[in-house]
Each structure stands twice: as structure tokens, then as C-alpha cells.
């Protein structure tokens, strides 16, 4: 797997240990927690990052209204089970044999059950809505400048193909970034929208996952864009299955 050969580090994932003991004596970087080798030329999957984190020695008309089926990650951190490709396994269980089904970004999409719970497939999250509120500024940002800067950020920093940034909405002080990526649209080598959103979320929180890079310095026409709160909504290709009890 590609890693910075000269000093054997992983530019895209600081939660790794790198050693020149890969194939052909090349630099190989392993994710903390799982020990899986990661490709340092692209983003590491959210599942491996969560696992590493758990093992490491925290309304207006122009804005999109999240659908009734949109999920918010209320459960917080957990130590996930990842498949051989580093993706979330459809069924997750904790130490006390409580199990639940997750989507492709690892967010719970069913009620919790026991070990008999079945999760037949990993349901893909095909639409992510990132809802940001920025700190007060002298005036509103120019919408097209803001749009261009956020698209550039996802393209250059997170290596997400521009076609997957569906829209950027803005009504001061709320910014919404829509990411869309159907199973059929995602080609081999494409960054997953869930991984890009997770890297962005950590950047916004000042917890950058990139090695040695400074934190995220977002500017629109030289004006700093400082985010004071973030909410992320996840929409799955198949709606989640919660009991009515949870919805009331």
C-alpha cells in the first residue's frame, strides 16, 4: 500500500503505525486497533478510524429539510466490527451481547436487540446532509464563493469526486452540504461519501485525521469560516426500521 516511503508515514491517517516491512520491504501502515494495512494515498474507511479511535492510548425554505427517514448519529462512539475490506459489518454487538444493525456509515438503523438479531445486508447511505452554523461575520458570505470553496475542499482535501457534492445551500448563518452517492455511481477507487463526511466532521471539530497537516483553515475570499455547530443527517437507500416506541 502506498505510504510516504522516505520517512514511512501515512499522510491521510495519523492513527496508524508505519514500518518498512510491507511487500518488497516497502513502507506499510497499519490502522491502530485492527492492524489492517491502509492505503495512504486515499482516505481510510470510517470503520477502521472508529476502531482506531477506540483503541488509541470526542429553517427556511431554501434549506433542505431532512427527510423523516434521516438518521442522526446519537449513539456516539463504539468499537465497531469491520469486514475484511474495512467497511462496517451490517450487525454490530457490544460486550454485553446487545446487537443492532448499522448502515454503511456505521449509524444504527434498527432498535437494539440480542444475538438473534439478523441484519441481512449492509444498507448503503446514499445521501448525507451536513448542516453547519457559522460564527457571526461582518456580512453574509457570497453564496457562489462559499459553494466554490466547499467544493474545492471536498475535491482537494478529501479527494471526493466533484459529482458527489450534489449541492451547497446557504442562508446565513446556516450552510448545508449535500453529498449523494448511489451504489451504482461509486466506482472502484472512488472515495466514499461517508468517509469524506467523517474526515470533514473531525476537521471541523479540530481533530484532523491527516498526518502533520495543520488543522482545517477554511476561508472564503480571505474571510475565515468558523463553524460553531455541526449536525449530520444520513439517508439510506432503504429506510431504517425503528419501532413506533422510539419515534414517539
Amino acid at each position: 500500500h502506498t505510504a510516504a516511503q522516505d520517512n514511512c508515514t501515512c499522510p491521510t491517517n495519523k492513527m496508524t503505525v508505519c514500518s518498512p516491512d510491507g511487500p518488497g520491504g516497502r513502507c506499510q501502515c497499519r490502522a491502530l486497533g485492527s492492524g489492517m494495512a491502509v492505503d495512504c494515498s486515499t482516505l481510510t474507511s470510517k470503520c477502521l478510524l472508529l476502531k482506531a479511535r477506540m483503541s488509541a492510548p470526542k429553517n427556511a425554505r431554501t434549506l433542505v429539510r431532512p427527510s423523516e427517514h434521516a438518521l442522526v448519529d446519537n449513539d456516539g462512539l463504539y468499537d465497531p466490527d469491520c469486514d475484511p475490506e474495512g467497511r462496517f459489518k451490517a450487525r454490530q454487538c457490544n460486550q454485553t451481547s446487545v446487537c443492532w444493525c448499522v448502515n454503511s456509515v456505521g449509524v444504527r438503523r434498527t432498535d437494539k436487540g440480542d444475538l438473534s438479531l439478523r441484519c441481512d445486508e449492509l444498507v448503503r447511505t446514499h445521501h448525507i446532509l451536513i448542516d453547519l452554523r457559522h460564527r457571526p461575520t461582518a456580512g453574509a458570505f457570497n453564496h457562489s464563493d462559499l459553494d466554490a470553496e466547499l467544493r474545492r475542499l471536498f475535491r482537494e482535501r478529501y479527494r471526493l469526486h466533484p459529482k458527489f457534492v450534489a449541492a451547497v445551500h446557504y442562508e446565513q448563518p446556516t450552510i448545508q452540504i449535500e453529498l449523494r452517492q448511489n451504489t451504482s455511481q461509486k466506482a472502484a477507487g472512488d472515495v466514499d461519501i461517508g468517509d469524506a463526511a467523517y474526515y470533514f466532521e473531525r476537521d471541523i471539530k479540530g481533530e484532523s485525521l491527516f498526518q502533520g497537516r495543520g488543522g482545517l483553515d477554511l476561508r472564503v475570499r480571505g474571510e475565515p469560516l468558523q463553524v460553531e455547530r455541526t449536525l449530520i443527517y444520513y439517508l439510506d437507500e432503504i429506510p431504517p426500521k425503528f419501532s413506533m416506541k422510539r419515534l414517539t
Epitope: 514511512c8 503505525v17 514500518s19 518498512p20 516491512d21 510491507g22 511487500p23 518488497g24 506499510q28 491502530l32 485492527s34 492492524g35 489492517m36 494495512a37 492510548p57 475484511p84
Partner: antibody
Amino acid sequence: QVQLQQPGAELVRPGASVRLSCKSSGYTFTSYWINWVKQRPGQGLEWIGNIFPSHSYTNYNQKFRDKATLTVDKSSSTAYLQLSSPTSDDSAVYYCTRGSGFDYWGQGTALTVSS
Amino acid sequence: DILLTQSPAILSVSPGERVSFSCRASQNIGTSIHWYQQRTNGSPRLLISYASESISGIPSRFSGSGSGTDFTLIINSVESEDIADYYCQHSYSWPFTFGSGTKLEVK
């Protein structure tokens, strides 16, 4: 040339903690994983765990999590395997080895737990 | 944990014969498999790394192949000094595990 040096044998009383050593030379000690492997007489090889010397990051086989503790002394390029409360089940040869494909091995330390 | 199954447990061949050792992983591990030889009372030594990479100082009669879940170690023309136990080991993820080994006997 790369070498991993281990004492040939150790004798320990049951219940008394023991620390096995593995001194590395001939390469940059802090750049490669050190693994520990157990082999009981006439049996196969079992991976105990590993340690990355530059920042002492460790991983353990669940089976050995309460038995083994891995540490390093960077100043002497030495890795250590400490076994707590040894019993006769811990009598075995313990090897230290380097990397992910274990390209260099120590000679092994034959640990005998006996009163 | 990833389980490695080696077969057969014992192989008995005549000098000069070609012999193959099998190692099967319980899940896809790419090419993260390594092969070792351990002679009686000796330390294991690395024969093949990452499924097929040859190791300096190891005779060219040793070769490896496979990817995913099925791997093979081949000795092209067995010599008497090859009498030993042979182990596969994966380095795909932690914990690393070894196969149970195959004992090579020469008739």
C-alpha cells in the same frame, strides 16, 4: 547484520513473575515491530503479541492478554516479555521475531516453570 | 480471528519429488501470508513472504503462490535437508495467527 539475541534458558518458580529479554542489533530498532511467539514442546507456534518500539504501541492475542506484558527499552534496543503468575502451562520456548513477515528470529528462550 | 488451516498434517515424499503445502484462510487476506520452515530444535526461518516473495538466502527450489484464501508453498525438488515442520502465518490484521503446521518426511 540483523540479530535478535535471547538467553537460551530460564527457570522460574510457579507464581513468580518472569521477564524474558530480546536484544536487537544491526537495524533501526524503533522502526520495526517486535513480535513474541510461544511454542510448547511438540506443538505449533502461537503469536502472543507485538510491540512497536518507537512509541511502545502494543497488541495482544486475547488468549495472552492477562498473562503477557510487552515492553521495550529503546536505549538498549531490547524488548521484554513479562509473564505473570507462571504455571506449568507457561513452560515453553519463547521466540522474539521482527516485522510482519517474521524475517529474523531470536534463538528462543526455553522457559521452565518448576518448583 | 482469522483461522489458517494447513493440510495435510504430514507429507511423506522421496528425494527429488515436487511437494506442495496448502494453507487456507477463513477469510480473504489478500497476499498477507508468510511461510516458515522449522527444523528439529531450531528457530523458524522465513521462506516466502507475502505469498510469493522470495527471501534472500533461501534456495530457489522454494516458491509460493496464491491470494485471497488459498495459498501454496512448493518445494520443486525435495532434498533431505528439507525435513522439517512448515508453518503459514498471516499478517492481514491483528491478531496474527499461524497454521497448525505440516510435517515433511523424506522416505
